[in-house]
């Protein structure tokens, strides 16, 4: 049996849409299947890797690095995006290409990113993981560190940084995939929200649906513990 | 309101050692991404720039004069100072010191500048 | 080093005229960057990035250019315009300026 619940939520362009949350019932009436998962069932993604899942993270991984900041011209925000998602005429899409990226680091002028940009997050901004010496950031941006600590300013000059950010990862379903939405949208989803996150490659979201101990390497399932939990 | 102004001796002899500092105010230089740059100028000519150091200590020259040139900080004393050894007339110029700011740049530029400093090389 | 060569050296210009200031550099670059100055004067950004106008600055100023052709338009000379600009490139180490181009009042 499915339970379904709709509702008007915000979503990713600012605007309120009819949502639908589909939530598989438990036939025996008890606890939702992320339930019975956080409890741990015997659930094989949380014991060993899947393939089916592997293949979804890397496809939304290769997605990711494609994508840029898309920030609104009316100044109410920015979101990341894939450029096709990303209005021509109401928006300004923030990517990188060529010669317009910033140069790897301060030591390297000539090579210039191509990878980004990421709304809300900068390598030439964030203190901390500072990009510089033996630990700048790739040019890829789904091997960026979250940024815990940002250059004190108010004000960047940089489009993608100095927008309201509406959007961050959201771990959504059973199957860890994450989504790039408002904090509004991923708690109707009953997803988890990584508020400390910009892209979904700084998330494991596998990790969050499984609970428990967390994995020794977030990208590698190990509780075959499970065998004996349930 | 950011300022820097640049002191040092308006004179000095061939063969001696020039030492210029730059004091500032309005910025610290251990704020994340701040620099603070050398530039000069010889009577009627252009611009060339000398050396700069960044907020983590990381320094940079112009490699043609790069054996000459040191480029120091005092954080606490919101200063920076140039040393330039075996000073020629050639070197006769103004020097200035500029931050560096990359406010909305891919790069950096040099945003504020002292009123510069003239310095002869005269025997 | 890369190269800056500016034309022309030096230009006579009325007030109201438009004028254009070109910057070639010896290799490619991705970003030029512009300076005035006035006698006496330490130089002051107009433009950074090819097209960005520094704070402060008039929107008589514009920059545009890639690769190796630069330029610096004003698009209606003001009295206060008369001085001496400057090209800068921060591609590679070292920085290099061009030798200035003077502009003066005809």
């Known amino acids: 049996a499915q339970h379904v619940t709709t509702q008007l939520v915000l979503r990713n362009k600012g605007v309120y849409e009819s949502v639908k949350y589909i939530q598989q019932e438990n036939f025996w009436i008890g606890p939702s299947s992320i339930d019975l998962i956080h409890l741990g069932a015997k659930f094989s993604p949380c014991i060993r890797k899947d393939q089916q899942i592997e293949q979804l993270v890397l496809r939304e991984r290769d997605l990711e690095r494609d994508s840029g900041c898309c920030v609104q011209n009316d100044h109410s925000g920015c979101i990341q995006t894939q450029r096709k998602d990303c209005s021509e005429t109401l928006a300004t899409f923030v990517k990188w290409q060529d010669d317009t990226g910033p140069p790897m680091d301060k030591s390297d002028l000539g090579q210039k990113r191509t990878s980004g940009a990421v709304c809300h997050q900068d390598p030439r901004t964030c203190e901390e993981p500072a990009s510089s010496g033996a630990h700048i950031w790739p040019d890829d941006i789904t091997k960026w560190p979250i940024c815990t600590e940002q250059a004190k300013s108010n004000r960047t000059g940089f489009l993608h940084m100095d927008c309201q950010i509406k959007g961050r990862p959201c771990c959504i379903s059973t199957k860890g995939s994450c989504e790039i939405t408002t904090r509004e949208y991923c708690e109707f989803m009953h997803g988890y929200f990584h508020e400390e996150a910009t892209l979904c490659s700084q998330v494991h979201c596998l990790d969050k649906v499984c609970g428990l101990l967390p994995f020794l390497n977030p990208e590698v399932p190990d509780q075959f513990y499970r065998l004996w939990l349930s | 309101q950011v300022t820097l102004r640049e002191s040092g001796p308006a004179l000095v002899k061939p063969t001696q050692t020039l030492t210029l500092t730059c004091t500032f105010s309005?910025?610290?230089?251990?704020?994340?991404?701040?620099?603070v740059g050398w530039i000069r100028q010889p009577p009627g000519k252009a611009l060339e720039w000398l050396a700069h150091?960044?907020?983590?200590?990381?320094?940079y020259y112009n490699s043609a004069l790069k054996s000459r040139l040191t480029i120091s900080k005092d954080t606490s004393k919101n200063q920076v100072v140039l040393t330039i050894t075996n000073m020629d007339p050639v070197d006769t110029a103004t020097y200035y010191c500029a931050r560096i700011q990359n406010y909305g740049s891919n790069y950096w530029y040099f945003d504020v500048w002292g009123q510069g400093t003239l310095v002869t090389v005269s025997s | 080093a890369i190269q800056l060569t500016q034309s022309p050296s030096s230009l006579s210009a009325s007030v109201g005229d438009r004028v254009t200031i070109t910057c070639r550099a010896s290799?490619?670059?991705?970003?030029m960057f512009w300076y005035q100055q006035k006698p006496g004067k330490a130089p002051k950004v107009l433009i950074y990035?090819?097209?960005n106008l520094a704070s402060g600055v008039p929107s008589r100023f514009s920059g545009s250019g890639s690769g190796t052709d630069y330029t610096l338009t004003i698009s209606s000379l003001q009295p206060e315009d008369f001085a001496t600009y400057y090209c800068?490139?921060?591609?590679?180490?070292?920085?290099?300026f061009g030798q200035g181009t003077k502009l003066e009042i005809k």
């Open positions: 990035d090819t097209s």
């Open positions: 150091i960044w907020w983590d200590d990381e320094k």
């Open positions: 309005g910025f610290s230089l251990s704020t994340f991404g701040r620099g």
């Open positions: 290799s490619r670059i991705s970003y």
């Open positions: 800068q490139q921060w591609n590679s180490y070292p920085l290099t």
